[in-house]
Each structure stands twice: as structure tokens, then as C-alpha cells.
């Protein structure tokens, strides 16, 4: 399951990318998951109310929420592995506050790698890929055994 | 130069289980990546997984997990392919290859694994 | 898997002819697209990788181009020593996959 150093430097490499423009990224990465798993949506009260791709790209708010996103995740990248810290409260206020489930949180990896295939195919081939397939894996796995420690079925 | 030496051919029974190894000189062995190939008599090239050896990270083809598993002794800087239940099907010549962003830059010369009773 | 056709699957030619191998990936690949030769005797070797850049040591004639899908190997000036299977593989998603493989006569 553990990343070798040249994975997370694929990952890092990659992730360089994305904070290039990290608001462009989180607004891609919500739309297609909102698109793709409609049933997502329902735990965002402030994007409930949006319907088409149209309206998803004019809302200010979900590009806010995406940049929101993707700056957590990149803070756990970063710490390559070494993430207690920063997952504890993620999971707290996940598991206790948002309940979002960790099927949710494949559905969102699934749609950061579709959004980087897209945006960066040549940066991300199938080493990268692997690579951060495997990162996102170690985060799911570590916000799962958090939300079993809080008692959230998630 | 970069080299990587394959052990050699075998002939081994069906059921049984085989370790091939690949001793790669002429460069740090942890700084690249390590993958086996399989090529049946006059066929095409399958490959069967990689394997970081300063990480012991592994990606494996679906179609060969539980059959390879792959390893890799740093202090040597040697790497493994174990087979095993070995049936007819697993005849064939199998080879390592250094790995460089997806590309495999230098290949070992292969070994021949022969599986018959 | 992506799926990875070669053709032709092989290919007589005479020395000091141009020849020109294709690859067409199942999907976009983009450029992750390497080519390799394999000689009798299990000697294989990369020649091109990310579908245009020449891999050390390998002689100016063998060059590749495309992205996407479609590729190409040209070999120019065909000599003696070039007589051996030309595989493709792409680098774009695992599995890693290879093309069926061309073989190279001279005529």
C-alpha cells in the first residue's frame, strides 16, 4: 500500500499542476462528480439548487468549494504518507458534521484522475497514474479507519 | 554499461513453482523502476507487473496476480519473479526490463521456463 | 485494457528501402508510445520512446511519429542488421500493453 519515493514524487509533480490553477481543477474535478453521481449533490445545501453543467460552471460557490477541496487534499499529498495530522479533524468533520460516506470519496478520486488525464496527459502517464491512484487510496483508507474510530458507518 | 543478467532456462513440472532472477549492474539498481515480461513461443509480449525496488511497490497485470509475485533483494541488486502452480500455459520466456517513464529502456536476456511432467 | 493493433503483422523489403510500421491504440494514449525491436536470440531492445524521441544509441534512420492513436515507425534506408520484430507498447495506462508484433524480412 506505502508509496515509494518515486511515486510520491510523480504525485507531487503532478499536484504542481493542478495548484497552477487550483480553482479551474476543483470546479472541473465538482462537476463531474455532481454529473456523474448526481446523488453527491445532495449533501451540498448550497449546490442542490443546480441543475445543468451551465449553471454548475457559472456558480461561483462550487468554484470556491473546489479550490477548498483540492487545497486539502494537496496539504495531505504533501505530507506523503505522514497525514495524521491533517486527516484527524478531515474525518471528524466528515464522519460527524457532513456524513459523507467513503463511497463518495472514490467517486471524487475517480473524478480527480479523470480531470488530470484530461488537463496533464503529459504528466500523467501510467506511472503518475498508479501513483495517484495509490496515493488516494492511502487517504480513503485512513479517513475510513477515522470514521470507524468516531462510530460513522460510513 | 547498464546490464541486467537473467538466470537461467528451467524445466520444471506442472503444479510445481519457480523463481527467475535478474541482476542488474551498471547503474543505481533503486533508482529505476524493474519489469517482467512474458513471451510464449511465437507469440507477442504480456506484461506482467513492475516493482519500485527502493520501495517494494508493485503493480501487477490483473491477469497474472496469483500466479507472479515479484520481489526484489536491494543488497544484490537483484529482482524476482516468482510462478507458481505452474500449468502448460506458463511456458514461455520471461523477461526483465530497467523502466524509465513507462518505456523499458534495457532488457535482460530472458528465461526460458519450460513447465512438462 | 487498451487495446494496442499493429500492422502490417510482417513485411518484406528490400535494402535501402523505406518502411513504415503503424500502431493504433483502443484509445487516446496521447504520446506514452514506445517502439522496441526483437532480434533471434531474445535480444530486445527500445528504439523510440514518447512516440518521437530516439532512444540512446540508436541509429538516426529508425524514427517515430504521431499522438493519440495512430502511430508510426519509419525506417529508412533499410540495412541488414534491421531484420528482427518490431513491437509498440503504450505507456498511457496499466495493464501496459504491446502490439501483435511486425516482422521484418528482406527480400
Known amino acids: 500500500m506505502g508509496l515509494s519515493d518515486g511515486e510520491w514524487q510523480l504525485v507531487l509533480n503532478v499536484w504542481g499542476k493542478v495548484e497552477a490553477d487550483i480553482p479551474g481543477h476543483g470546479q472541473e474535478v465538482l462537476i463531474r462528480l455532481f454529473k456523474g453521481h448526481p446523488e453527491t449533490l445532495e449533501k451540498f445545501d448550497k449546490f442542490k439548487h443546480l441543475k445543468s453543467e451551465d449553471e454548475m460552471k457559472a456558480s461561483e460557490d462550487l468554484k470556491k468549494h473546489g479550490a477548498t477541496v483540492l487545497t486539502a487534499l494537496g496539504g495531505i499529498l504533501k505530507k506523503k504518507g505522514h497525514h495524521e495530522a491533517e486527516i484527524k479533524p478531515l474525518a471528524q468533520s466528515h464522519a460527524t458534521k457532513h456524513k459523507i460516506p467513503v463511497k463518495y470519496l472514490e467517486f471524487i478520486s475517480e473524478c480527480i484522475i479523470q480531470v488530470l488525464q484530461s488537463k496533464h496527459p503529459g504528466d500523467f502517464g501510467a506511472d503518475a497514474q498508479g501513483a495517484m491512484n495509490k496515493a488516494l487510496e492511502l487517504f480513503r483508507k485512513d479517513m475510513a479507519s477515522n470514521y470507524k474510530e468516531l462510530g460513522f458507518q460510513g | 554499461q547498464v546490464q541486467l543478467q537473467q538466470s537461467g532456462d528451467d524445466l520444471v513440472k506442472p503444479g510445481a513453482s519457480v523463481k527467475l532472477s535478474c541482476k542488474a549492474s551498471g547503474y543505481t539498481f533503486t533508482s529505476y523502476w524493474i519489469n517482467w515480461i512474458k513471451q510464449r513461443p511465437g507469440q507477442g509480449l504480456e506484461w506482467i507487473g513492475r516493482?519500485?525496488?527502493?520501495?517494494?511497490?508493485?503493480y501487477y497485470n490483473e491477469m497474472f496476480k496469483g500466479k507472479a509475485t515479484l520481489t526484489v533483494d536491494t543488497s544484490s541488486s537483484t529482482a524476482y519473479i516468482q510462478l507458481s502452480s505452474l500449468s502448460s500455459e506458463d511456458s514461455a520466456v520471461y523477461f526483465c526490463?530497467?523502466?524509465?517513464?513507462?518505456?523499458?529502456?534495457?532488457w535482460g536476456q530472458g528465461t526460458s521456463v519450460t513447465v512438462s511432467s | 485494457d487498451i487495446q494496442m493493433n499493429q500492422s502490417p503483422s510482417s513485411l518484406s523489403a528490400s535494402l535501402g528501402d523505406t518502411i513504415t510500421i503503424t500502431c493504433h491504440a483502443s484509445?487516446?494514449?496521447?504520446?506514452?508510445l514506445s517502439w522496441y525491436l526483437q532480434k533471434p536470440g531474445n535480444i530486445t531492445k527500445l528504439l523510440i520512446y514518447e512516440a518521437s524521441n530516439l532512444h540512446t544509441g540508436v541509429p538516426s534512420r529508425f524514427s517515430g511519429s504521431g499522438s493519440g492513436t495512430g502511430f508510426t515507425l519509419t525506417i529508412s534506408s533499410l540495412q541488414p542488421e534491421d531484420i528482427a520484430t518490431y513491437y509498440c507498447q503504450q505507456g498511457q495506462r496499466y495493464p501496459l500493453t504491446f502490439g501483435g508484433g511486425t516482422k521484418l524480412e528482406i527480400k
Open positions: 516493482i519500485a525496488p527502493e520501495g517494494d511497490s508493485t
Open positions: 526490463a530497467r523502466e524509465v517513464r513507462n518505456a523499458m529502456d534495457y
Open positions: 484509445q487516446n494514449i496521447h504520446v506514452w
